[in-house]
Every structure is written in structure tokens, then in C-alpha cells.
């Protein structure tokens, strides 16, 4: 007996061939022996089987001795043994219809779990193997679980269902709702304008929700809400903003915040949360602000940074076109009685300059 695997909602063609390449009488029946379709004279007739309204045959191939049955919009309950009767012989085809669905919305928040459920006919014992867009392989039986979705899990998942050495492939589009970056750091000199951008890693037809930026300044004992906003159909509107600092927010996506001036008291880290309508949980992005200040006071040239910096970052004071350099893995460096000239304060990571500030030291006569 031939085994054919089908996908729920798809179309399948069950073939049946006569030895004579000519138009002859044929019938397709189900395992209850009830007629689905057949030929009467030159016409296709339909039996009363519940499949009849979704079954058809390629009339153009009848004179070649091909009497296939096409079943549209397959259902799990279409799984059955079908019998083709032609030239006094019977050909049996076992059709097994499978369905694979995500048992929740396919738009999931980062960190949430994804469960794929296999619908299968009674008595079948299929195995399922899924491959994520990032190349992760997961195997299972009736259900497949991905406990914690990551950004890279967004995209088309390819799942292969195997039964009786036959396979059928399903493609499921999963959208992981997250920001493009989990964390970002902005490095600015004191007084410069600061731009914070929070691009999303997905696109939705209608995007509605609300968000807030909480800020923990390095110098402050507790965090505070800097801004709250609403998102309606990709349009941003500010609900509440602190007086100090007075943030500005772009009206369109991507979410964009402007801090008029980088000041040491603002240096620190923030957490932008976005709650989407009809979704449980929130999207998060961490943002850090590092501020640099270079000052000369009497005989002391000082360079300082505020905000979250890694211990491996190097802070240096260097006289332009001269070899004189002071470097430390610290948040402040200074030079006593500096030479006159243009001094550079550099914050660098393994030789890569992250932030630079110039200060001119004038000669003292």
C-alpha cells in the first residue's frame, strides 16, 4: 500500500494509473467503500462522501490512463485509505494528513516560549524536526518547545514531519518582538546634544502600545522616570516628561530621544520599556550615557568620565604632536603643571577611541 503525506489546508494528488493508455471507467472510494468520485460516460460524477466537494480529477489526463484524485483544503480527518478501482483492479493509497501550528500567537516577545503542536491522524507515530532561522535544530513528537526565544529566532522555521519513511515540510513564520539591540552606549563630551535611538527588530502593520524611560544617574541614589509616551499606529506622542532633563521625542518610529546637553549629572544608565497592545510582557532596551569633561584649574589639567564604563577602558591625557601621555584604567586622569599646547583626552577600548575631548593649555608667564 502506497503512503502519501499531506499538509492540513493544502492540496494533495493521489495517483492511479491504468495499464491501457485510454479513457476507461474508474472510481475512487474511501475505506467505508463510499464513492468519492468516478467517471460516468465522459463525465466526472461525485459520490456522497464528505470529501466529494473538495475532490476532483484531471480530466485532461484520463485518455492517458491517469485517473488521479485531487483533494483540496486537506483536513486531518481526511486521513484514510483511499481505493482506486480501475480495469478490475484495486489500488490502495494511505493518506496521512498532518498539521503544525504555533499554539499561541506567532508574534512573541523575546524571552517568551514558543510551542509548536503537531496535529496528526489517530494511530500515526510521526517525528518532528524543526530548524530555526539561525540554524538551531529541535526535535520532538507531538509538541516542540523553544523555552526562551531570542532575536535571531525571528523568521521562517522549517519543520519536517516524518512518518513511514516519508516526509512533509512545514514553514512557520515567527516574529520575535524585540529591539534591535539589547544594550547600547552613547559617549558624549559635556555640553553636546545626545541622541538615543531604539530601533525595533520587527515590523508590524499596526503598532500600538506605551513606553517609558527610567534613568539611574550615576550620581543619584534612585532611578527616576524621564519620559512616558504612547504609540498609536506607529505614531509617538509624549505623555509626561521630567523638567530636568527636558527630553524631546521623535513623532515617528524608530523611537528617538534627544537630550539637549550631556552633563555629568545625567551620566548613567536607562531602561526603555515598551508594552505592546494585546501582548503580555514588555520589550526592553538598556541605554548608557558616558560623559567626558576636560578642565584646567590652576596648575592641574584633569580629564574625567562619568557613567557606566568597563574597567578595561583606558583614559588618557596626551599632548598633541608630543610624546607626553598619562594613561590609566580609571575614571579620571590628571597632569600637574601641563606643558602649553593642545591636549587630548581620550577614552579608548583596546586602542579604539570611543570619546575624545580637546583642551588648550596656555603658557603661564
Amino acid at each position: 500500500k502506497k503512503v502519501v503525506l499531506g499538509k492540513k489546508g493544502d492540496t494533495v494528488e493521489l495517483t492511479c494509473n491504468a495499464s491501457q493508455k485510454k479513457n476507461t471507467q474508474f472510481h475512487w472510494k474511501n475505506s467505508n467503500q463510499i464513492k468519492i468520485l468516478g467517471i460516468q460516460g465522459l463525465f466526472l460524477t461525485k459520490g456522497p462522501s464528505k470529501l466529494s466537494d473538495r475532490a476532483d480529477s484531471r480530466k485532461s489526463l484520463w485518455d492517458q490512463g491517469c485517473f488521479s484524485m485531487i483533494i483540496k483544503n486537506l483536513k486531518i480527518e481526511d486521513s484514510d485509505t483511499y481505493i482506486c478501482e480501475v480495469e478490475n483492479k484495486k489500488e490502495e493509497v494511505e493518506l496521512l494528513v498532518f498539521g503544525l501550528t504555533a499554539n499561541s500567537d506567532t508574534h512573541l516577545l523575546e524571552g517568551q516560549s514558543l510551542t509548536l503542536t503537531l496535529e496528526s491522524p489517530p494511530g500515526s507515530s510521526p517525528s518532528v524536526k524543526c530548524r530555526s532561522p539561525g540554524g538551531k535544530n529541535i526535535q520532538g513528537g507531538r509538541t516542540i518547545s523553544v523555552p526562551q526565544l531570542e532575536r535571531q529566532d525571528s523568521g521562517t522555521w522549517t519543520c519536517t514531519v516524518s512518518q513511514d519513511q516519508k516526509t512533509v515540510e512545514f514553514k512557520i513564520d515567527i516574529v520575535v518582538l524585540a529591539f534591535q539591540k539589547a544594550s547600547s552606549t552613547v559617549y558624549k563630551k559635556e555640553g553636546e546634544q545626545v541622541e538615543f535611538s531604539f530601533p525595533l527588530a520587527f515590523t508590524l502593520e499596526k503598532l500600538t502600545g506605551s513606553g517609558e524611560l527610567w534613568w539611574q544617574a550615576e550620581r543619584a541614589s534612585s532611578s527616576k522616570s524621564w519620559i512616558t509616551f504612547d504609540l498609536k499606529n506607529k505614531e509617538v506622542s509624549v505623555k509626561r516628561v521630567t523638567q530636568d532633563p527636558k527630553l524631546q521625542m521623535g513623532k515617528k518610529l524608530p523611537l528617538h530621544l534627544t537630550l539637549p546637553q550631556a552633563l555629568p549629572q545625567y551620566a548613567g544608565s536607562g531602561n526603555l520599556t515598551l508594552a505592546l497592545e494585546a501582548k503580555t510582557g514588555k520589550l526592553h532596551q538598556e541605554v548608557n550615557l558616558v560623559v567626558m569633561r576636560a578642565t584646567q584649574f590652576q596648575e592641574n589639567l584633569t580629564c574625567e568620565v562619568w557613567g557606566p564604563t568597563s574597567p578595561k577602558l583606558t583614559l588618557s591625557l596626551k599632548l598633541e604632536n608630543k610624546g607626553a601621555t598619562v594613561s590609566k584604567q580609571a575614571k579620571a586622569v590628571w597632569v600637574l603643571n601641563p606643558e602649553a599646547g593642545m591636549w587630548q583626552c581620550l577614552l579608548s577600548d583596546s586602542g579604539q577611541v570611543l570619546l575624545e575631548s580637546n583642551i588648550k593649555v596656555v603658557p603661564t608667564w
Epitope: N32, Q33, I34, K35, G38, Q40, T45, K46, G47, P48, S49, K50, S52, D53, R54, E77
Partner: antibody, heavy 120, light 107 residues
Framework: QVQLQESGPGLVKPSETLSLTCTVS????????WSWIRQPAGKGLEWIGR???????TYNPSLKSRVTMSVDTSKNQFSLKLSSVTAADTAVYYC??????????????WGQGTTVTVSS | DIQMTQSPSSLSASVGDRVTITCQAS??????LNWYQQKPGKAPKLLIY???ILETGVPSRFSGSGSGTDFTFTISSLQPEDIATYYC?????????FGGGTKVEIK
């Protein structure tokens, strides 16, 4: 067990639309085909057509241009509409459940029938 | 459509008589034939399916035979409760069609 009950007006004017509803009780409407059969007084049975819970229909070609069937799974009901009626449509209208078993296909549960008279 | 022709349209027989009704299909319907019994004011009731298989609970005095286009329904010994109209119905292809019916009366 499953019971069927037809309901609708007993008198319809010529050229108007006959509307009947069949309520299924004691069981689910899903997974079956549900049909309408009519029988003019003293005459034989005529299969009008059938519908399933997906809304898929098959109508008798002799009535196809005038017949519309619909289903409301939330109410466990299915309906028949027959337009442009004439006196020839006067009959007892039955709703029935179609059942498939090994070697068998037919109507296994019937309503008690409702008489519809077409007259002005 | 497949036409089903039943004969006779009516018959009168005595209790205990053997009663035979025939049904002819306009084309080959294999064995896809049901026989129904309808009593006055009631809905039809299935007696025989697939031309000759007796439905569960139906008395054995009822039987059916035939294949292709010609079918026969028999009541081996007519009983008073058998007074009814009998219909054949094909289920080889859609639309499902019925014979014109045979009204059985007691003499």
C-alpha cells in the same frame, strides 16, 4: 440522542422566499452533513441539498438556482432559503442528518417535518 | 442525475403474503442503494443499505437484493405493522435521488 426540529412559516406567498431553520439538539452539529428533503402531498421524496459546518454546500441541480443553505454553529442550527416559490413548492419539508458508515450513506436522523403551503 | 423508478406504485396484500417491490436505476449504481419505510405522518426510517444489508434492529422478514441497475425489496411475510410507503434511494452519486415510492396496504 440527536433530535432535529424544523421551524418557519407554514404559509408563503407565490414569488416570495421560503425560509426554514432546523435546530439540532442532543448532539453537536459539527463533522456531519445536514440535508433538506421535501415531499409534496401524496408524492415521493426529493433531496434539496446539504451543508456542513464549514459552510460547504451541494444542491440538487433541479433547484440550485433558487436554493441557499447556511449554518450557524453557535446556535446549532442550519437553514434553508428557497426563492421565487410557486404552488409546486408546497410540500412537507424535512431536515435530516446525513451519515456515512461502512457501505452505507444516507439520512439516519430526521426532523418530524413541517408543512409549507405556497398560496396567495 | 440518476433516475430511480419504483414499481408498483401501490399494492394490496394479505397478512402473511410475500411482497416484492422493484427499483430500477437509470445507470449502474453498483450496490449503493437504501430502502426506507415511511409510515403516515412520520419521517422515513432506514431498513436496508448497500442493496442487501439489514439495518440493526430491523426484522429479518425484510430483505433486499440486486446490483447494477435492478434491485428488489421483499417482505417475506407481511405483517399489519408493515403498512407504509417504501422508498428506494441511491447513493452512488450526487444528487441523492429517491424512487417514487410504493404504498403497501393490507387487503
Amino acid at each position: 440522542q440527536v433530535q432535529l426540529q424544523e421551524s418557519g412559516p407554514g404559509l408563503v406567498k407565490p414569488s416570495e422566499t421560503l425560509s426554514l431553520t432546523c435546530t439540532v439538539s442532543g448532539g453537536s452539529i459539527s463533522t456531519y452533513y445536514w440535508s433538506w428533503i421535501r415531499q409534496p402531498a401524496g408524492k415521493g421524496l426529493e433531496w434539496i441539498g446539504r451543508i456542513n459546518t464549514s459552510g460547504s454546500t451541494t444542491y440538487n441541480p433541479s433547484l440550485k438556482s433558487r436554493v441557499t443553505m447556511s449554518v450557524d454553529t453557535s446556535k446549532n442550527q442550519f437553514s434553508l432559503k428557497l426563492s421565487s416559490v410557486t404552488a409546486a413548492d408546497t410540500a412537507v419539508y424535512y431536515c435530516a442528518r446525513e451519515l456515512e458508515r461502512y457501505y452505507y450513506y444516507g439520512m439516519d436522523v430526521w426532523g418530524q417535518g413541517t408543512t409549507v403551503t405556497v398560496s396567495s | 442525475d440518476i433516475q430511480m423508478t419504483q414499481s408498483p406504485s401501490s399494492l394490496s396484500a394479505s397478512v402473511g403474503d410475500r411482497v416484492t417491490i422493484t427499483c430500477q436505476a437509470s445507470q449502474d449504481i453498483s450496490n449503493y442503494l437504501n430502502w426506507y419505510q415511511q409510515k403516515p405522518g412520520k419521517a422515513p426510517k432506514l431498513l436496508i443499505y448497500y442493496a442487501s444489508i439489514l439495518e440493526t434492529g430491523v426484522p429479518s422478514r425484510f430483505s433486499g437484493s440486486g446490483s447494477g441497475t435492478d434491485f428488489t425489496f421483499t417482505i417475506s411475510s407481511l405483517q399489519p405493522e408493515d403498512i407504509a410507503t417504501y422508498y428506494c434511494q441511491q447513493y452512488d452519486s450526487l444528487p441523492l435521488t429517491f424512487g417514487g415510492g410504493t404504498k403497501v396496504e393490507i387487503k
